[in-house]
Every structure is written in C-alpha cells, then in structure tokens.
C-alpha cells in the first residue's frame, strides 16, 4: 500500500522538516529558516510561533517542531498551547475587568489564578465549622454539633438489656 501511495503521490515520501515543493516538480525541499513541518507529506512548512511580549520561549522552534511559549513571571497561561497570558493575582483575590480584587466575604481563592469560590457550607453535611474561612482559605469542617454536646462520646454505649414483658419507661 505504501509503495502504491508513493507512486501516486510523490509528496507522501517527504519527511518531517521538509515540504513537497511544487516549484521543483514536487521534490522534497527542506523547510526554509524559521519554519517547520512536524509531519511528513506536507505541501508547505508552517511559520514558527514567536514568543514575544508577555510570552517567553519555553522551547525553541526547529525545522520539525513549533516553538512553545509560556508566560513571563506575574502571568499564567490560558488556552490550548498557552494561547493567552493572564495576569496573576494574590491568593485571596480574583481577576476582574478592573484588575485584581479581594474576595468578597464568604468566598476564598487559594491560588494566584481563577475566581473566588464560596466557603464550604459545613451544615449541609451536618457538620460544624472547626476553623473559620478567610479570603485565602476555605473553612475546615469538624464533627456535627450533636457530637460536641456535653457528655457526648465518640463511642456509642451499648443499649441496656430489656426484661421481657416490660415496656420501656
């Protein structure tokens, strides 16, 4: 099959790092400077990505693979292949259109990116708040309030034996 394909399409023989050059009777030509082809059989080489401005080069372009960018300090990547750089905020903040803003009461953010999220509602799980939440940290839930009542023990005592014929009092 490969032999048949190459007889029909000479371009299929062109390896990564080359392109099938129509100007040269479809012979394989190496990619020109600052371009690449990462797969065989390409009819053009792609221009290398340039990591400029807030982007910085994580991996240089080669004739067979594109450059890879990340973000300069104070920024983080967003999107596939780090297509955008977004400003970092401090923990306890979120990024808005007007810049970094502190989390509202009842919310927190423990990262330099993302949005403020509501504290966990311990009572939904029948638990109590063991450690209060802050702008940077979620609340820590503890045992249920019933478990903390005076005389309460974590070990449930055995039920007393009942004599037959007596109703409970």
């Amino acid at each position: 099959f490969e032999r048949t394909r190459s007889l029909q399409d000479p371009c299929s023989n062109c390896p990564a790092g080359t392109f099938c050059d129509n100007n040269r009777n479809q012979i394989c030509s190496p990619c020109p400077p600052n371009s690449f082809s990462s797969a065989g059989g390409q009819r053009t080489c792609d221009i290398c990505r340039q990591c400029k401005g807030v982007f910085r080069t994580r991996k240089e372009c080669s004739s067979t693979s594109n450059a890879e960018c990340d973000c300069t300090p104070g920024f983080h990547c967003l999107g596939a292949g780090c297509s955008m750089c977004e400003q970092d905020c401090k923990q306890g903040q979120e990024l808005t259109k007007k810049g970094c803003k502190d989390c509202c009461f009842g919310t927190f953010n423990d990262q330099k990116r993302g949005i403020c999220r509501p504290w966990t509602n311990c009572s939904l799980d029948g638990k109590s708040v063991l450690v209060n939440g802050t702008k940077e940290r979620d609340v820590v839930c503890g045992p249920s309030p019933a478990d903390l009542s005076p005389g309460a023990s974590s070990v449930t005592p055995p039920a007393p034996a009942r004599e037959p014929g007596h109703s409970p009092q």
Epitope: G17, P30, C31, P32, P33, N34, E60, C61, S62, S63
Partner: nanobody, 111 residues
Framework: AVQLVESGGGLVQPGGSLRLSCAAS????????SAWYRQAPGKQRELVAW???????HYADSAKGRFTISRDNTKKTAYLQMNSLKLEDTAVYYC?????WGQGTQVTVSS
Amino acid sequence: AVQLVESGGGLVQPGGSLRLSCAASGNIFSIRVSAWYRQAPGKQRELVAWIAWDNIAHYADSAKGRFTISRDNTKKTAYLQMNSLKLEDTAVYYCNSGDSWGQGTQVTVSS
C-alpha cells in the same frame, strides 16, 4: 548569484566509501539550509540528506546509518560522507542551498 561546485564522485565497489564536497561562493552556509539530492537515470530527483536551518542533520530512510552530512562554514563547504555504498546508490548527486544548485557529480557503484 551563489555558485555551488560538487566534487568527489567516482566509481566505487559495493561496500566502499566516497566523500562528496560542495564548495560555495558567497557567504551562504552560515544562514541557509544545505542539502544533498540525487537523481538516478529515469527517476525523480530525491532528497538524501540535509542540514536544516536549526543546524540539525536529517537523512532520508535510504541514507540513515550509512551517510553523514556535515558543513564547514569557514570553508563554505558542505560534505556528504557515504559509507557501505550499494548498487542502488548509483546516481548523479547534487548539492543545493536555497535556490542554488550545483552541476552534479556522478557516483557509480558497480562490481
């Protein structure tokens, strides 16, 4: 215009070696791709080995493990060391850089 002149071709027995040279006029080897092609009678010209713009050497499957491409920027010369030559390596070998081609040098492998 840049001129490329190949040398080093000849008649060799199977299993033998040859070293082709490609001398360039003009300061091109420091910035351009260097490539060796070959063309056997009745066949299309094919890429054999090349040094890409990132200075990494690449080889066609038919050349891997047997041929070595190199470049000396100070001498403005590219080389193709060919070892373990086979009958099917018989062809005219051409040096290429950018839009410039050499005139070709004949390599014949025959017993």
